[in-house]
Interface confidence: low
């Protein structure tokens, strides 16, 4: 059965700075990532593979990442209020077959203790 | 509404084995990972063992290397654990996880699933 809150953890934060998890089924080859902040595109990042199966990795608006074969994780350093706000993961996919993913989104809260450099 | 459902577990005597069963059912557009996890009395959830979609082994707690085998039918979108040799101190209440993507209309939303657990109790 499913699990009350069953969505996995979207943002972890460390070190001042805050990483979002952005999953996708991975059964897929070759697609678009982008993290969106309210509605606009903070970082993207395209996946897709060529002959001999290179992989090639390319990012539009560019964000620290970090890729795995399930996940694109994007992040933020250097955290203050200006940051919190609504994220969602936006996928595209261009194989297998192409289709639009929404991955389901959150609200990133940011209180004193996950800022970069409080004043003590 | 997707569903995890279990069997296979029960009372069994020291070196003997069982199989679990985890089949997943209902809107399912695609699994990531499935894993066994279990819990025994005053314990935390642990990880017995874990697959990717594509079927390699990503782990195996050391406590079951050699005995437990994690297996899986991606056609029936159901995993496996095969439990030889068991030990008393596996007795445990065992659940399986999977890493599940469901469709609403054009979306599709990665979600973790639970089933509900099944006990398994190792004694002469």
């Known amino acids: 059965e499913i699990n009350g809150s069953a969505n996995y953890e979207m943002f972890i934060f460390h070190n001042g700075g805050v990483q979002i998890l952005c999953k996708y089924p991975d059964i897929v080859q070759q697609f678009k990532m982008q993290l969106l902040k309210g509605g606009q595109i903070l970082c993207d990042l395209t996946k897709t593979k060529g002959s001999g199966n290179t992989v090639s990795i390319k990012s539009l608006k560019f964000c620290h990442s970090q890729l795995s074969n399930n996940s694109v994780s994007f992040f933020l350093y250097n955290l203050d209020h200006s940051h919190a706000n609504y994220y969602f993961c936006n996928l595209s996919i261009f194989d297998p077959p192409p289709f639009k993913v929404t991955l389901t989104g959150g609200y990133l809260h940011i209180y004193e203790s996950q800022l970069c450099c409080q004043l003590k | 509404q997707v569903q995890l459902q279990q069997s296979g577990g029960g009372l069994v005597q020291p070196g003997g084995s069982l199989r679990l069963s985890c089949a997943a059912s209902g809107s399912i557009f695609s699994i990531n990972g499935m894993g066994w996890y279990r819990q025994a009395p005053g314990k935390e959830r642990e990880l017995v063992a874990g697959l990717t979609s594509g079927g390699s082994v990503t782990n195996y707690a050391d406590s079951v290397k050699g005995r437990f085998t994690i297996s899986r039918d991606n056609a029936k979108n159901t995993v496996y654990l095969q439990m030889n040799s068991l030990k008393p101190e596996d007795t445990a209440v065992y659940y399986c996880?999977?890493?599940?993507?469901?469709?609403?209309?054009?979306?599709?939303?990665?979600?973790?699933?639970w089933g509900k657990g099944t006990q398994v109790t190792v004694k002469p």
């Open positions: 996880r999977a890493e599940i993507f469901t469709r609403t209309g054009e979306n599709y939303y990665g979600m973790d699933y």
